[in-house]
Interface confidence: medium
């Protein structure tokens, strides 16, 4: 019995369906086929869980969190024992193993391993201003999303005709910050932060209004 090499890892967006491949060759009929799918969750590597089981011509549920979401992609018994996971959750991220036995065919590699990563688009980022908005001051525009796998990068732009940040601005796309030094009335305007990763984007807006000093009346 020989389980075929499977792709090292699979990525899927949260809520979508993941298909975990596992196929094998065997010299025996599939009368005594026994298939166990196990997962070692990334969130709890010390606690492997059963995903689904095929034994004695019957299918059995694995851990409760997989109930109703997991099944074999084809009619069993078969030499393709790939499974699907519907409505993928962040907690489904982990290393999946298919263990195949088909007596009397013994020997050979009977385990296939596939990594699953569930990706999450950035949640709506939070935009805020740090520092005084008085003319001549330095301000920092902050942007961050609570969720996002892989970790989002942040892109700031000024929503005017040029879209460019002021010349005195420095942008950090990883941290989501823009530092604008020595702000002037020309710095005023609507700024947009875009959080993005491999599977999605999300935006927030910030209105920066630079405060000019009030002329003092000399009595």
């Amino acid at each position: 019995l020989e389980v075929s090499e499977s792709p090292g890892s699979i990525q899927v967006a949260r809520g979508q369906t993941a298909v975990l491949p596992c196929t094998f060759t065997t010299s025996a009929a599939l009368i005594n086929l026994n298939v166990i799918w196990m997962v070692t969750p990334l969130s709890n590597a010390n606690q492997p869980e059963q995903v689904i089981l095929y034994q004695g011509g019957q299918m059995f549920d694995g851990a409760p969190r997989f109930h109703g979401r997991v099944g074999f992609t084809g009619t069993m018994p078969a030499t393709n024992v790939s499974v699907f996971i519907n409505n993928t959750q962040l907690s489904d991220t982990g290393t999946y193993q298919c263990l195949v036995n088909n007596l009397p065919d013994i020997g050979g590699r009977n385990i296939g391993v596939t990594g699953l990563t569930v990706l999450v688009p950035p949640s709506a980022p939070h935009c805020q201003i740090q520092g005084s908005q008085d003319i001549g001051s330095d301000v920092i525009l902050l942007c961050s999303s609570e969720e996002g796998i892989p970790r989002p990068t942040y892109l700031w732009e000024k929503l005017d005709n040029t879209l460019k940040l002021p010349p005195t601005a420095t942008q950090d796309q990883v941290q989501g910050t823009v530092t604008i030094r020595n702000i002037s009335t020309l710095t005023s305007g609507l700024y947009q932060c875009v959080a993005s990763n491999a599977i999605g984007t999300s935006t927030c807006l910030l209105d920066l209004q630079v405060i000019s000093p009030q002329p003092r009346n000399i009595g």
């Epitope: 967006a13 688009p121 709506a124 990068t153 892109l155 732009e157 929503l159 005017d160 005709n161 040029t162 879209l163 460019k164 947009q192 875009v194 959080a195 993005s196 491999a198 599977i199 999605g200 984007t201 999300s202 935006t203």
Partner: antibody, heavy 123, light 108 residues
């Protein structure tokens, strides 16, 4: 893997209509700003229009040559972008690409692009 | 309407540095992007926001933009870099992209 697949191209007579589709996969389509770009045979790229995500208002903008004739729409439940082309002219003959606005916003560039679908306007 | 001008063709020897220019009125005040298109293929974004590289684009691709000119530089040019290159500007906030006429890069 992020993928865009266009369909619906073909031969149409001047004054006729055609609807192009772009099926998206591998990313959260509903969050994405999407765009159409065309390329006449042997010529350069020409921006056609763009639609924002519904969360960003879902508004559309168009290039001057197609404004009033072309309409961009989206069906987030089907992960599909559309380009409805009416009152077609011979100069609309081109390969039409759909593309994702890569980093959101206006300045993030277009990435990836679909494989394109050819629209031929001829009598 | 806003126009971007590129040289129709640029030639470079393998391993040398290729520079492709794109000019437009006060282009440096706007953001520039660059796209690579190989024959029979769809365009690929190689530079956005003047000088930022998308993931998967080799480090030999770089960009700059000031005054009236944006420049795409390919250092240590390889045969696989032979393609058409298009510059693009964001135009106004309602015009997502204005494209240049394209430059054919030939690696001799």
């Amino acid at each position: 893997e992020v993928q865009l697949v266009e369909s619906g191209g073909g031969l149409v007579k001047p004054g006729g209509s055609l609807r192009l589709s772009c099926a998206a996969s591998g990313f959260t389509f509903s969050n994405a700003w999407m765009s159409w770009v065309r390329q006449a045979p042997g010529k350069g790229l020409e921006w056609v229009g763009r639609i924002k995500s519904k969360t960003d208002g879902g508004t559309t903008d168009y290039a001057a040559p197609v404004k009033g004739r072309f309409t961009i729409s989206r069906d987030d439940s089907k992960n599909t972008l559309y380009l409805q082309m009416n009152s077609l002219k011979t100069e609309d003959t081109a390969v039409y690409y759909c593309a994702r606005v890569a980093h959101g916003g206006y300045s993030g560039g277009l990435d990836p692009w679909g494989q394109g679908t050819l629209v031929t306007v001829s009598s | 309407s806003y126009e971007l001008t590129q040289p129709p063709s640029v030639s470079v020897s393998p391993g040398q540095t290729a520079s492709i220019t794109c000019s437009g009125d006060k282009l440096g005040d706007k953001y520039a992007s660059w796209y690579q298109q190989k024959p029979g293929q769809s365009p690929v974004l190689v530079i956005y926001q003047d000088s930022k590289r998308p993931s998967g684009i080799p480090e030999r691709f770089s960009g700059s933009n000031s005054g009236n000119t944006a420049t795409l530089t390919i250092s240590g040019t390889q045969a696989e870099d032979e393609a058409d290159y298009y510059c693009s500007s964001t135009g106004t906030a309602h015009t997502l992209a204005v494209f240049g006429g394209g430059t054919k890069l030939t690696v001799l």
